[in-house]
């Protein structure tokens, strides 16, 4: 229904705390360079204004759209052009073009320093002094580094953060209480970020229909006992929520997500038997819980689908009458039977089915033409299954770090023109799939592996889009979202690449590496590995292993030496020489 004042409506629905948090996230995602204090000031002004509209919906400007109100605030920031360059040009436009312009200027890889966690005592002190400001800083720092982070989920992670600090700051050993718990939240939040970015990419590049297909497949797997009408309703609502968040309409998004959670909890009987535990939780936890609820038990006696989608004489008639509904039903029926498939795979099968009907229904004898379509799915199913088996076997053999290195070599060979930091980040993230997925039961491995890889590769594509350097990557990234992972997997050594010259300074290290945390040490070694592959793209795995083992031995020796600096300066050049010889 229409409200006289949109801002008053959202303030009332969300409550002050969530309202302020969401406005802070919105501003931080749009203007990623501004300080927390600058944004906090704007948030307070918007909140004060919202309160005046709650008191009197007819007050001046209360009838304005949220985009107009927020955009006007952002455009009033002093020194906008100095700090943001051409983003300031957005302010010359009218809504809705102005908001579209802000969205186009979101930076997926802002040049901000890594978000460093203060040491435990300092964190607890500032948290106790002002929990609200502390949490505000958290929202601001995460949102500006992840401009598409799913806003209501970020509120959930902030709440988790709050609970951990409340608990651990009361302990004697704050550090050992905080570190594993906060590491856990950070890991989950980073995965949430890449997954949501993938959804926004789907929405931006291929529109609502593509996202809705994704939602139908995912929801049908999770709720196999719900009927098609129920799945369609949930998919439509979920598409609206995600469209709003991806479009920067964070208040509407959070409000509609809360409504969707409410609807699901009020209609458990027709959706799933697994929702009650989630529905007993408070709002943020409830919505989060519902988003990752375990799959309901599959119905015992689902018939084969060939009767309706291949053997029925009316297939082409049914398809022609309502293409999207017919294909949606196919996707629903296939997905509810296969919780063991990835959503990407299910969408590839639906796409193949659609292409077959398009071709066959135009022919003289359609049934003879589409009669074998389900059998033709077999290679599409076998390919990701083999990928999972091969990669999980390799992960089990090498462990996470070794597996990351194997992927790093593979991807540097596929796209050696890509910058080393991007290759290292991608390989480290892709390599985590082993730890995340390979330990799961058989029927959960494929969906875990492929959907996670797809999200990571989406980030590779976004970073590459900014500065395109590899034709291989451009080719895989310009196709459909669900074909990306198979495309990257199929890439081989880039034969067009001219190897990099060997530069000794690339492989020169100093004693400061010894005091780095383990993760940073790994990144240094992986950077060297990528550079080695760029120098010798056709080096064998054995050659690379020899060099890396030598390198590890060199670090170990020099970091244990009494005079580290001398060891690095004398042994370093010897290492470089040995490397060159080993790769000759």
């Amino acid at each position: 229904e229409a409200h006289k004042s949109e801002i008053a409506h959202r303030y009332n629905d969300l409550g002050e705390q969530h309202f302020k948090g969401l406005v802070l996230i919105a501003f931080s995602q749009y203007l990623q360079k501004c300080s927390y204090d600058e944004h906090a000031k704007l948030v307070q002004e918007v909140t004060d204004f919202a309160k005046t509209c709650v008191a009197d919906e007819s007050a001046a400007n209360c009838d304005k759209s949220l985009h107009t109100l927020f955009g006007d605030k952002l455009c009033a920031i002093p020194n906008l052009r100095e700090n943001y360059g051409e983003l300031a040009d957005c302010c010359t436009k009218q809504e809705p073009e102005r908001n579209e312009c802000f969205l186009q200027h979101k930076d997926d890889n802002p040049s901000l320093p890594p978000f460093e966690r203060p040491e435990a005592e300092a964190m607890c002190t500032s948290f106790k002094e002002n929990p609200t400001t502390f949490m505000g800083h958290y929202l601001h720092e995460v949102a500006r580094r992840h401009p598409y982070f799913y806003a209501p989920e970020l509120l959930y992670y902030a709440e988790q953060y709050n609970e951990i600090l409340t608990q651990c700051c009361a302990e004697a050993d704050k550090e050992s209480c905080l570190t594993p718990k906060l590491d856990g939240v950070k890991e989950k939040a980073l995965v949430s970020s890449v997954r949501q970015r993938m959804k926004c990419s789907s929405m931006q590049k291929f529109g609502e229909r593509a996202f809705k297909a994704w939602a139908v497949a995912r929801l049908s797997q999770t709720f196999p006992n719900a009927d098609f009408a129920e799945i369609t309703k949930l998919a439509t609502d979920l598409t609206k929520v995600n469209k709003e968040c991806c479009h920067g309409d964070l208040l509407e998004c959070a409000d509609d997500r809360a409504e969707l959670a409410k609807y699901m909890c009020e209609n458990q009987a027709t959706i799933s038997s697994k929702l009650q535990t989630c529905c007993d939780k408070p709002l943020l936890k409830k919505a989060h819980c519902l988003s990752e609820v375990e799959h309901d038990t599959m119905p015992a006696d689902l018939p084969a689908i060939a009767a309706d989608f291949v053997e029925d004489q009316e297939v082409c008639k049914n398809y022609a009458e309502a293409k999207d509904v017919f294909l949606g039903t196919f996707l629903y029926e296939y997905s509810r039977r296969h919780p063991d498939y990835s959503v990407s795979l299910l969408l590839r099968l639906a796409k193949k089915y659609e292409a077959t009907l398009e071709k066959c229904c135009a022919e003289a004898n359609p049934p003879a033409c589409y009669g074998t379509v389900l059998a033709e799915f077999q290679p599409l199913v076998e390919e990701p299954k083999n990928l999972v088996k091969t990669n999980c076997d390799l992960y089990e053999k090498l462990g996470e770090y070794g597996f990351q290195n194997a992927i790093l070599v593979r991807y540097t060979q596929k796209a050696p023109q890509v910058s080393t930091p991007t290759l290292v980040e991608a390989a480290r993230n892709l390599g985590r799939v082993g730890t995340k997925c390979c330990t799961l039961p058989e029927d959960q491995r494929l969906p875990c592996v492929e959907d996670y890889l797809s999200a990571i590769l989406n980030r590779v594509c976004l970073l590459h889009e900014k500065t395109p350097v590899s034709e291989h990557v451009t080719k895989c990234c310009s196709g459909s979202l669900v074909e990306r992972r198979p495309c990257f997997s199929a890439l081989t050594v880039d034969e067009t690449y001219v190897p990099k010259e060997f530069k000794a300074e690339t492989f020169t290290f100093h004693s400061d590496i010894c005091t780095l945390p383990e993760k940073e040490k790994q990144i240094k070694k992986q950077t060297a590995l990528a550079e080695l592959v760029k120098h010798k793209p056709k080096a064998t795995a054995e050659q690379l292993k020899t060099v890396m083992d030598d390198f590890a031995q060199f670090l170990d020796t020099c970091c244990k030496a009494a005079d580290k600096d001398t060891c690095f300066s004398t042994e370093g050049p010897n290492l470089v020489t040995r490397c060159k010889d080993a790769l000759a």
């Epitope: 799959h295 038990t297 599959m298 015992a300 006696d301 689902l302 018939p303 084969a304 689908i305 060939a306 291949v310 029926e333 296939y334 039977r337 296969h338 919780p339 063991d340 389900l374 059998a375 799915f377 077999q378 199913v381 076998e382 039961p441 029927d443």
Partner: nanobody, 115 residues
Framework: QVQLVESGGGLVQPGGSLRLSCSAS????????MGWYRQAPGKGLELVAS???????HYADTVKGRFTISRDNSKNMVYLQMNSLEPEDTAVYYC?????????WGQGTQVTVSS
Amino acid sequence: QVQLVESGGGLVQPGGSLRLSCSASGSIWGIYHMGWYRQAPGKGLELVASITVDGSTHYADTVKGRFTISRDNSKNMVYLQMNSLEPEDTAVYYCDIRNVGGDYWGQGTQVTVSS
């Protein structure tokens, strides 16, 4: 062509046990359902137990606690362990394996529970 072969049926005394096996030969992929059905003389076909791709198991009320269905994915095999057998369990037992493309049935194996 897919063929299912059941084995393990026979004559057993009340309270006894049997283990039925079903193996699929030929190219069957993308299995989402494996089940055992039975048909007693003069009766219709009834679902005894099924196991879906996610590992969920379903049992007819009359066999709950006595029968256990299991599978071996790598070999496309499905089993039915039947304990505390009763005369009412006498029937021909059929194995059923499904993928989206079709429903594949065995020829059946006779189970007779009698003293």
